[in-house]
């Protein structure tokens, strides 16, 4: 059988998995396990939170972040904002690609009340050679991270 | 034209969709439907609940499961987990996946009121031949089934 | 190299944006921006809010709306579904593909309160040529456009 | 308008070292990808590396390992640090900026020749 | 790595003439080519982007086409500055790859 171009061991993958690491508090993208446990990386790069494309063409990205607290404490946005965001040689900010909009801390009747969300995101996107992808979550102290199951970041080429 | 090793036609792929008996109350894994209606197997199999790599790879795996009920009955818990769990050759336990935390019950702001909710998992997860992954949710007295549209449970080889 | 079925260049792929057109109040499906910004049609068709195959085979389709409103007013529904529906020469009414509910309002505590939340769909369906699926909201007037980041809909084969 | 100056060639030993460095004016360094390119005398063009604003860095597979690329957007420069150097390194070194493709601005080039 | 071939690899031609130069690529590389022209003693100067996207400043008797893997350079009308030599550039995979050259010279 011939050689074909798309194998299945060429074709741009990653998974991405989130770690103590991943929220820096700094207000940059979260930073994200490439290696350990089922993270990995095939036909992608990875630079500081970011999934760098090296073949142009369309990707399925997917983010999903485990959000979680005790009731909605003062200083904390009521409406939590997930995205993924685009860098390119073109443009010197950062494009919005995905974004959800969340209002998770109302489910809890009370300040005492432990409550949990979930939100995922995912799309076809074109990327270029060098084009950058990161999440970013506001507020990420509402972030919760655990073993690499409940925070992720992926990506293949359709 | 050439056939190649990854045409539309053999490229593995399944949606298996929820039944009236996907529910078994006896602790383990979401049974599914595997062939009527909206449901398929494509170059994987099944098996108890369990989706089964005979070709290995990595695989987009994903599930939704429709929650709901009426306000929050005392002995539900406040917090429900669904989850993809891989069962393999190498371990005895199955091995988390992709995994969601939610607080559905507290949308609801009287203990008669009606609550919706869904929970959307999906991933690039390394599937040996082999290996199966299950869907579970705790506690699954909250899913709610109809037709094989609102619960189902699919993956498809990247 | 042999030129093989499946490239990267020619596998049917879309995503579409959600745009100040999307919401007809009609009672139609939502509609959606083809071409500018983020969107694209690659190998598959556009009608009127729905993506039509021109190729058959398992296609992977998923969509997301950004739902958000202030308290829960009157004559709005408290259980919003989120749907992608097929429509094919086989049937004359439309078919559940993928189906979600959800109870969003209860999150705000008082009517006053803004809330936000998001709904994401995804799974493989079997699409023959000619066949077109579209996105239904219930009630539509909770869906919150804005850039065409926050609801979308998109589809590619596998 | 935009302006590249590369500098820091010259001769040097096989196994020496040499910094290249490209001085960039006429627009917003900061915000452009900035890329390495070389011309051996008489031959074509190979890409050397590239760098992003983040500072992602990407190395072609004859020099990963001896070239280092990086760039101070206080002082509008970029650079390339050269060890290792063989023969084969012999080449007019360019920077180039990247925007709407990979080398949309070039400087004028530095002479790098390695020989004993 | 993506192999790109041009073709011819020189040619004469006249003031006035019409001039074709292709470029092959190994494999499917979609629009992402780019086409370059360099003087003797000069840093090459960018002329096509995108395949057929011209570049700022860039007279338009340049003109770029194709798509996949065969791609052309196309010079509506040879004036003296025209002579030189043309590469093309492949930007669709790392790493980025350039073609040997076509030398264009006075007949």
């Known amino acids: 059988l011939i050689q074909e171009r798309r194998s299945h061991q060429n074709n741009p993958a990653a998974h991405l998995t989130g770690a103590n690491s991943s929220l820096t508090g700094s207000g940059g993208p979260l930073l994200w396990e490439t290696q350990l446990g089922l993270a990995f990386l095939r036909g992608l790069d990875y630079h500081d939170g970011a999934l760098v494309a090296n073949k142009a063409g369309y990707y399925y990205i997917y983010s999903k972040v485990q959000l979680g607290g005790v009731g909605c404490p003062l200083g904390l946005a009521s409406t939590i904002t997930h995205g993924l965001y685009k860098r390119t040689p073109r443009y010197p900010e950062e494009l919005e690609l995905l974004v959800s909009q969340q209002s998770p801390c109302g489910r809890a009747t009370s300040n005492s009340r432990v409550w949990w969300d979930s939100s995922f995101l995912g799309g076809v996107v074109h990327l270029e050679v060098g084009e950058e992808v990161v999440v970013r979550v506001l507020d990420e102290r509402l972030v919760r991270l655990r073993d690499g199951t409940r925070s992720y970041f992926g990506a293949f080429m359709v | 034209l050439i056939q190649e090793r990854r045409s539309h036609q053999n490229n593995p792929a399944a949606h298996l969709t929820g039944a009236n008996s996907s529910l078994t109350g006896s602790g383990g894994p979401l049974l599914w439907e595997t062939q009527l209606g909206l449901a398929f197997l494509r170059g994987l199999d099944y098996h108890d609940g369990a989706l089964v790599a005979n070709k290995a790879g990595y695989y987009y795996i994903y599930s939704k499961v429709q929650l709901g009920g009426v306000g929050c009955p005392l002995g539900l818990a406040s917090t429900i987990t669904h989850g993809l769990y891989k069962r393999t050759p190498r371990y005895p336990e199955e091995l988390e996946l992709l995994v969601s935390q939610q607080s559905p019950c507290g949308r609801a702001t009287s203990n008669s009121r009606v609550w919706w909710d869904s929970s959307f998992l999906g991933g690039v997860v390394h599937l040996e031949v082999g290996e199966e992954v299950v869907v579970r949710v705790l506690d699954e007295r909250l899913v709610r089934l109809r037709d094989g549209t609102r619960s189902y449970f699919g993956a498809f080889m990247v | 190299l042999i030129q093989e079925r499946r490239s990267h260049q020619n596998n049917p792929a879309a995503h579409l944006t959600g745009a100040n057109s999307s919401l007809t109040g009609s009672g139609g499906p939502l509609l959606w921006e083809t071409q500018l910004g983020l969107a694209f049609l690659r190998g598959l068709d556009y009608h009127d809010g729905a993506l039509v195959a021109n190729k058959a085979g398992y296609y992977y389709i998923y969509s997301k709306v950004q739902l958000g409103g202030v308290g829960c007013p009157l004559g709005l529904a408290s259980t919003i579904t989120h749907g992608l529906y097929k429509r094919t020469p086989r049937y004359p009414e439309e078919l559940e593909l993928l189906v979600s509910q959800q109870s969003p309002c209860g999150r705000a505590t008082s009517n006053s309160r803004v809330w936000w939340d998001s709904s994401f769909l995804g799974g493989v369906v079997h699409l023959e040529v000619g066949e077109e699926v579209v996105v239904r909201v219930l009630d539509e007037r909770l869906v919150r456009l804005r850039d065409g980041t926050r609801s979308y809909f998109g589809a590619f084969m596998v | 308008q935009v302006q590249l100056v590369e500098s820091g060639g010259g001769l040097v030993k096989p196994g020496g070292s040499l910094r290249l460095s490209c001085a960039a004016s006429?627009?917003?360094?900061?915000?452009?990808?900035m890329s390495w390119i070389r011309q051996a005398p008489g031959k074509g063009l190979e890409w050397v590396s590239y760098i992003s604003r983040s500072s992602f860095i990407y190395y072609s597979e004859s020099v990963k390992g001896r070239f280092t690329i990086s760039r101070d957007n206080a002082k509008n420069s970029l650079y390339l640090q050269m060890n290792s150097l063989r023969a084969e390194d012999t080449a007019v070194y360019y920077c180039a900026r990247w925007e709407l493709s990979p080398f949309d601005y070039w400087g004028q080039g530095t002479l790098v020749t390695v020989s004993s | 790595d993506i192999q790109m071939t041009q073709s011819p690899s020189s040619l004469s031609a006249s003031v006035g003439d019409r001039v074709t130069i292709t470029c092959r690529a190994s494999q499917g590389i979609s629009n992402y080519l780019a086409w370059f022209q360099q003087k003797p003693g000069k840093a090459p100067k960018s002329l096509i982007y995108?395949?057929?996207s011209l570049q700022s400043g860039v007279p338009s008797k340049f003109s770029g086409s194709g798509s996949g893997t065969d791609f052309t350079l196309t010079i509506s009308s040879l004036q003296p500055e025209d002579f030189a030599t043309y590469f093309c550039?492949?930007?669709?995979?790392?790493?980025?790859?350039f073609g040997p050259g076509t030398k264009v010279d006075i007949k």
């Open positions: 995108a395949a057929s």
């Open positions: 006429g627009f917003t360094f900061s915000d452009y990808y």
């Open positions: 550039q492949q930007y669709n995979t790392y790493p980025f790859t």
